[in-house]
């Protein structure tokens, strides 16, 4: 979660909430009483922008949080990595029945990078996210977190970009990091032929045919 953000060479980041300067300013619905942007400190005394919601006492929660528009940069399949904490309902007194331990992840493809409102019916559900049994215990500044990491993928995508949305239905969640990326096959040289960076196909198993070129001082 902390330190310099180094990712594998074959991953191209489209969104990284941890590297945004200033507030994230994502769209929340309702505007108040649902998701809230909260800063916490990392061990380098710099703020981490998180989104939090914890309406575990109230029934029938339906709190939405939508990212800014994310360009897909030609990628047909993108991956969403979410680092979050999710409080065990058993540790909260008097919340049985209203407290949940999951949240929902959605996406919506759009060519419009300036959509101002969340229209729930436009979004397609990717998955229900729950806290895994395995978590990473991290010291972030002056507090300790049990951090879950979940990765989901979505595709094939066809429009210029897309929005992600998180739906809370009554859990106690802090979204600590949201990263969206696609995978590519890096530039490769084989038998004096050079093949360029290539974005992976719509499916994880898709083969993408690319034309190579001869390296310098060689010919076909």
């Amino acid at each position: 979660v902390t330190g310099s953000r180094v990712y594998p060479a074959n991953e191209v980041t489209l969104l990284d909430s941890r590297s945004v300067q200033g507030e994230l300013g994502w769209i929340a619905s309702p505007l108040e009483g649902g998701w809230e942007e909260v800063s916490i400190m990392d061990e380098k005394n710099t703020p981490i922008r998180t989104y939090q919601v914890c309406n575990v006492m109230e029934p029938s929660q339906n709190n939405w949080l939508r990212t800014d528009w994310i360009t897909r940069e030609g990628a047909q399949r993108v991956y969403i990595e979410i680092k979050f904490t999710l409080r065990d309902c058993n540790s909260l007194p008097g919340v049985m029945g209203t407290c949940k331990e999951t949240f929902n992840l959605y996406y919506y493809e759009s060519d419009n990078d300036k959509e101002r409102f969340i229209r729930e019916n436009q979004f397609v559900k990717i998955d229900t996210i729950a806290a895994d049994e395995s978590f990473t215990q991290v010291d972030i500044g002056d507090r300790i977190m049990k951090l879950n990491t979940e990765i989901r993928d979505v595709g094939p995508l066809s429009k210029k970009g897309f929005y992600l949305a998180f739906q809370d239905v009554g859990a106690c969640i802090a979204l600590v990091s949201v990263r969206v990326f696609y995978k590519k096959c890096p530039l490769t040289v084989r038998n004096l032929a050079q093949f360029p960076d290539t974005i992976t196909g719509a499916d994880t198993s898709s083969l993408v045919e690319v034309r190579g070129s001869c390296v310098n001082n060689s010919e076909e």
Epitope: S39, Q52, V53, C54, T85, I140
Partner: antibody, heavy 124, light 107 residues
């Protein structure tokens, strides 16, 4: 119900040692870290540090490094504050207070339960 | 370390009046702030957490506001039970220092 019960008042001489206790009940002791706060007579509150109730690891504020020691008796759901080589300026009321051990968001990030305080008087 | 400067140090007011207590942090604490009330001889009681959220059971005449380095606690229509001392405390990197306190007295 949830409560932190502290030991009774102490009258000590300079140079002596005092150990005060804070017994937790009504919740799982290891779910919350225990913090200590000093309040000298007529003065404000001063955060002394905390102890991790899972690992027993203490963290001290700079002004409380050296003569002060936090410890636990987990089986008895009790935290302790020991002050060695007492000085007159240690005369104060000492509070224990809890906060969740793990951060799950600002909704629970504050001292929600405090002990009633233990008054320590240091006088020759 | 972050210093919390609370003002005023004391305040003499009448029942029914409105008061505002302020707390200034020496650097941005990103709303990681709580307010407590303490009566003479008692332990502090939580009033407000995360700068603006009212703790359970706290009357609605209390309200917290602020961001960055400037925070305030407002008490509308003071009641006799509101007299005592008030403290702010930050939670932005240890040590979690308190403000110097504000003593609210009956005029």
């Amino acid at each position: 119900q949830i409560q932190l019960v502290q030991s009774g008042p102490e009258l000590k001489k300079p140079g002596e040692t005092v150990k005060i206790s804070c017994k937790a009940s009504g919740y799982t002791f290891t779910d919350y870290s225990m913090h200590w706060v000093k309040q000298a007579p007529g003065k404000g509150l001063k955060w002394m540090g905390w102890i991790n109730t899972e690992t027993g690891e203490p963290t001290y504020a700079d002004d409380f490094k050296g003569r002060f020691a936090f410890s636990l008796e987990t089986s008895a759901s009790t935290a302790y504050l020991q002050i060695n080589n007492l000085k007159n300026e240690d005369t104060a009321t000492y509070f224990c207070a809890r906060i969740p051990l793990y951060y799950y968001g600002s909704r629970y990030w504050y001292f929600d339960v405090w002990g009633a305080g233990t008054t320590v008087t240091v006088s020759s | 370390d972050i210093q919390m400067t609370q003002s005023p140090a004391s305040l003499s007011v009448s029942v029914g009046e409105t008061v505002t207590i302020t707390c200034r942090a020496s650097e941005n604490i990103y709303r990681n702030l709580a307010w407590y009330q303490q009566k003479q001889g008692k332990s502090p009681q939580l009033l407000v957490y995360a700068a603006t959220n009212l703790a359970d059971g706290v009357p609605s005449r209390f309200s917290g506001s602020g961001s960055g380095t400037q925070y305030s606690l407002k008490i509308n229509s003071l009641q006799s039970e509101d007299f005592g001392s008030y403290y702010c405390q930050h939670f932005w990197g240890t040590p979690w220092t308190f403000g110097g306190g504000t003593k609210l007295e009956i005029k």
